[in-house]
C-alpha cells in the first residue's frame, strides 16, 4: 500500500517517500521505485538553508555599498551572506537592508539619549504632563504648558503628542 | 532626488572662523530637521549640531558648544555652521544630514583644516 507520510527528511511524491536535499543542495530529479533523489550543489553565490526540494537556490544577499552596507559575514552554499552598516552608522532592521546615521524617536517619544560612533539614538516615551509632536534624533519630551500661570484654564487636556490647549477663564456676570 | 551641497570649508588658523552652508533640493528643507555631522582623519563620525525645521530649537556637542553656531534659511533652502574661535581638533570633513538620515541622502562634506 502506497505510504500517506514520509519519515523526518523526506517527501512524498507520486505515492513515493522521496530523500530531501540535504542543505547546500537543490533539487534535479525526483526519486523513482530504482533511483535516489538526485541533487545538485548550490552555485557559487547561492545557498539553501535548509533539507528541501527546491529546483532553484535562492541568491547570495548583495550588501550594496551606495545604500551603506558591507559584508559582515560571507555566504556559503548552505548560509546567506549577513550584511552590517559602515562605521557610525546604524541598520534599519533586523535584516540590516539599509543603513541610518541614527535613528530619530516619533511623536509621543522623546530623545533620552543622542546617538554616537557606537550606540543608536535612545528614545523613551514622554510621560504623563509631557508631549512630543515631532520626529527628532535630538528633542527630548517637552512639558505641557502651564495654563494656571498664564492666567488661563486647560481648554482641551494634553496628551504625549500634543501639548494642553489653555483657554480664558469663564467670568461669572 | 535629495542632494545636499556642503561648501564653505577651507584652511584656517586656530583662532579663526569659517561658515559653512549646505544647499538642499529635491524634498521640502522647511519640513526636515537637519543636522552637521564631522569626521575628522581616520576617526568616526561625530554629530556636531542640529536644528528643528522652525529653526528654533537647536543642540551642540559639548565639544562645540558656545564656539560654533547652527541656523537655517528655510527660504534659501539652507542650512549654516558659523564656526569661531577654530582649534586643531576641529579639523574634519563636515556633512550635513537630513531626517531620517539615510546613507544615500549623505553629501560628500566640505574639509575644514584648522592649522598654524
Known amino acids: 500500500e502506497p505510504p500517506t507520510a514520509c519519515r523526518e527528511k523526506q517527501y512524498l511524491i507520486n505515492s513515493q517517500c522521496c530523500s530531501l536535499c540535504q542543505p547546500g543542495q537543490k533539487l534535479v530529479s525526483d526519486c523513482t521505485e530504482f533511483t535516489e533523489t538526485e541533487c545538485l550543489p548550490c552555485g557559487e553565490s547561492e545557498f539553501l538553508d535548509t533539507w528541501n526540494r527546491e529546483t532553484h537556490c535562492h541568491q547570495h544577499k548583495y550588501c550594496d555599498p551606495n545604500l551603506g552596507l558591507r559584508v559582515q559575514q560571507k555566504g556559503t552554499s548552505e548560509t546567506d551572506t549577513i550584511c552590517t552598516c559602515e562605521e557610525g552608522w546604524h541598520c534599519t532592521s533586523e535584516a540590516c537592508e539599509s543603513c541610518v546615521l541614527h535613528r530619530s524617536c516619533s511623536p509621543g517619544f522623546g530623545v533620552k539619549q543622542i546617538a554616537t560612533g557606537v550606540s543608536d539614538t535612545i528614545c523613551e516615551p514622554c510621560p504623563v504632563g509631557f508631549f512630543s509632536n515631532v520626529s527628532s534624533a535630538f528633542e527630548k519630551c517637552h512639558p505641557w504648558t502651564s495654563c494656571e500661570t498664564k492666567d488661563l484654564v486647560v481648554q482641551q487636556a494634553g496628551t504625549n503628542k500634543t501639548d494642553v490647549v489653555c483657554g480664558p477663564q469663564d467670568r461669572l456676570r | 532626488e535629495v542632494q545636499l551641497l556642503e561648501s564653505g570649508g577651507g584652511l584656517v588658523q586656530p583662532g579663526g572662523s569659517l561658515r559653512l552652508s549646505c544647499a538642499a533640493s529635491g524634498f521640502t528643507f522647511r519640513d526636515y530637521e537637519m543636522w552637521w555631522v564631522r569626521q575628522a582623519p581616520g576617526k568616526g563620525l561625530e554629530r556636531v549640531s542640529a536644528i528643528n525645521p522652525q529653526g528654533t530649537r537647536t543642540y551642540y556637542a559639548d565639544s562645540v558648544k558656545g564656539r560654533f553656531t547652527i541656523s537655517r534659511d528655510n527660504s534659501k533652502n539652507t542650512l549654516y555652521l558659523q564656526m569661531n574661535s577654530l582649534r586643531a581638533e576641529d579639523t574634519a570633513v563636515y556633512h550635513c544630514?537630513?531626517?531620517?538620515?539615510?546613507?544615500?541622502?549623505w553629501g560628500q562634506g566640505t574639509l575644514v583644516t584648522v592649522s598654524s
Open positions: 544630514a537630513k531626517l531620517p538620515f539615510t546613507f544615500e541622502d
